[in-house]
């Protein structure tokens, strides 16, 4: 044969032309539309991606591949039929027209056709393997999706049951809250009613209180009048008793005293029912010895035993140790009760000491000591004070710790001088210290710049002499 060429016709079919001598053989083969030519950029593993395809996309592609396979199968069948038909025709023609040496050409053509068929078959096999691979992958993905779906379904079921539980709980709580609200409303109503009742009661009580206050004012006026009368009577009675006891003892010393209840201090007098200011007879602790004292039954709840009073300068306070020991002056006026009695009394239980002061300008102040006692004479009636409160200075004007008592004839101070002689009066001098309530009495307009006057430094300063002073004691548990 002269030549053999392959070309494409106008409609895209493959054309095999064989020239042999005067004879020319042309074979037309159909090209499948859905198949790629061997020269096309085809990658056999293009479907094997790392990232999984979406489920719907995979199904679509699978369908496309199935169609391709089906088309290929049909095409193969057509090709076989076509080859058989052509072979029959060719064989008839060859038998009719061909010479002996054309047999080789025919065999070559047959071989080429077989090669073509083999090539197509190989391609189909490749596609088939790819489809199978993709199918397997898709099956795995489907299985994964199925498992994931099952898991999600389980989670949804769990969450649904949880939501149901929470809804049940919520409804229970809502019911409870509603019940509580109802209860609260009822309580509020009852409270409102009670409030209204109380307001009525308060207004009633206010009117009663107003009436009582009016009555109290009237009673107070009457009481003060009665108290004055009683005080006057008491003084008269006391004077009479003194006169009678003097005259009786002069006439008949064997007449026994009328038995009477003894009081240790004014607090006991007060508790026995004697609640009027005045002079009362007190008995020394564990003794029959008596002493007269003035009792303040009004100030700060009453029951106060007055141990010192200055008010007008009528009594001389520049006295001896013995006089300060036993006491001197007039209990209804200026006086000193006595160190021995005060020492013994404050030895029995805890006492408080209150010192009340008046200046010449009409001002008053006080110092209150929560703890007070005097040591025995052996320790020079040393003063002990603790727990200061009051308006007469934040610092104690009686030196702390307490000092021994000193008089003009008993110098126990901490000064090389003799404070009692220099400043006059008996007192718990330091060296000489910030106070002396037993100093010289100076009248108004002569009371300033006096170093030896009635001094309470932390209220009025060093040179000011006070108008009036009162020292009083009472049991701490009164």
């Amino acid at each position: 044969y002269n030549n053999f060429r392959k070309s494409m016709d106008s409609i895209g079919k493959k054309q095999y032309q064989v020239q042999h001598g005067s004879c020319s053989y042309t074979f037309l083969l159909p090209e499948m539309d859905n198949c790629r030519s061997s020269s096309s950029p085809y990658v056999s593993n293009a479907v094997q991606r790392d990232a999984p395809l979406e489920y719907d996309d995979s199904v679509q592609r699978l369908q496309v591949l199935e169609n391709i396979m089906e088309n290929n199968t049909q095409w193969l069948m057509k090709l076989e039929n076509y080859i058989q038909d052509n072979m029959k025709k060719e064989m008839v023609e060859i038998q009719q027209n061909a010479v002996q040496n054309q047999t080789a050409v025919m065999i070559e053509i047959g071989t080429n056709l077989l090669n073509q068929t083999a090539e197509q078959t190989r391609k189909l096999t490749d596609v088939e393997a790819q489809v199978l691979n993709q199918t397997t992958r898709l099956e795995l993905q489907l299985l994964e999706h199925s498992l994931s779906t099952n898991k999600l379904e389980k989670q949804i079921l769990d969450q649904t049951s949880e939501i149901n539980k929470l809804q049940d709980k919520n409804s229970f709580l809502e019911k409870k809250v509603l019940a509580m609200e109802d209860k609260h409303i009822i309580q509020l109503q009852s409270i409102k009613e009670e409030k209204d009742q109380l307001q009525v009661l308060v207004s009633k009580q206010n009117s009663i209180i107003e009436e009582l206050e009016k009555k109290i004012v009237t009673a107070t006026v009457n009481n003060s009048v009665l108290q004055k009368q009683q005080h006057d009577l008491m003084e008269t009675v006391n004077n009479l008793l003194t006169m009678m006891s003097t005259s009786n003892s002069a006439k008949d010393p064997t007449v026994a005293k009328e038995e009477q209840i003894s009081f240790r201090d004014c607090a006991e007098v007060f508790k026995s029912g004697h609640t009027t200011n005045g002079i009362y007879t007190l008995t020394f602790p564990n003794s029959t010895e008596e002493i007269k004292a003035y009792c303040d039954m009004e100030a700060g709840g009453g029951g106060w035993t007055i141990i010192q009073r200055r008010e007008d300068g009528s009594v001389d306070f520049q006295r001896t140790w013995k006089e300060y020991k036993v006491g001197f002056g007039n209990p209804s006026g200026e006086y000193w009760l006595g160190n021995e009695f005060v020492s013994q009394l404050t030895n029995q239980q805890r006492y408080v000491l209150k010192i009340h002061l008046k200046d010449w300008e009409g001002n008053e102040a006080y110092s209150l000591y929560e703890h007070f006692y005097l040591s025995s004479e052996e320790l020079n009636y040393r003063i002990h004070l603790k727990g200061l409160t009051g308006t007469a200075g934040k610092i104690s004007s009686i030196s702390q710790p307490g000092n021994d008592f000193s008089t003009k004839d008993g110098d126990n101070d901490k000064c090389i001088c003799k404070c009692s002689q220099m400043l006059t009066g008996g007192w718990w001098f330091d060296a000489c210290g910030p106070s002396n309530l037993n100093g010289m009495y100076y009248p108004q307009r002569q009371n300033t710049n006096k170093f030896n006057g009635i001094k309470w430094y932390y209220w009025k300063g060093s040179g000011y002499s006070l108008k009036a002073t009162t020292m009083m004691i009472r049991p701490a548990d009164f």
């Epitope: 030895n347 239980q349 703890h371 006692y373 052996e378």
Partner: nanobody, 120 residues
């Protein structure tokens, strides 16, 4: 002059006993309340026990310490049993009020103190 002199202190092992004495002079002893106080280093003086002239007493040591007095000898005693290391202190004798006060304020005469050391 009024004086109080303590004696009987010393070193003792934990669980042991000591008897402190306090002799008074120059004061009407029988009418005074006598008390024992102690002071550990860096701490305030604290009440231990007190006894009145008639013999009534009060203490703070849960029955381990007993106070007593002999008015004829003008002496007060403190018997300390089952001693603990925390009982280590200087023990002071004091004379005071006629009532059984626990506050140092109410005692106006003090001894110089005696050291008690309890080792563990």
């Amino acid at each position: 002059e009024v004086q109080l002199v303590e004696s009987g202190g010393g070193l003792v092992q934990a669980g042991g006993s000591l008897r402190l004495s306090c002799a008074a002079s120059g004061r009407t002893f029988s009418s005074s309340v006598m008390g024992w106080f102690r002071q550990a280093p860096g701490k305030e003086r604290e009440f231990v026990a007190a006894i009145s002239g008639s013999g009534s007493s009060t203490d703070s040591a849960q029955g381990r310490f007993t106070i007593s007095r002999d008015n004829a000898k003008n002496t007060v005693y403190l018997q300390m049993n089952s001693l603990k290391p925390e009982d280590t202190a200087v023990y002071y004798c004091a004379a005071g009020r006629a009532f059984l006060a626990r506050d140092t304020f109410y005692y106006d005469i003090w001894g110089q103190g005696t050291q008690v050391t309890v080792s563990s």
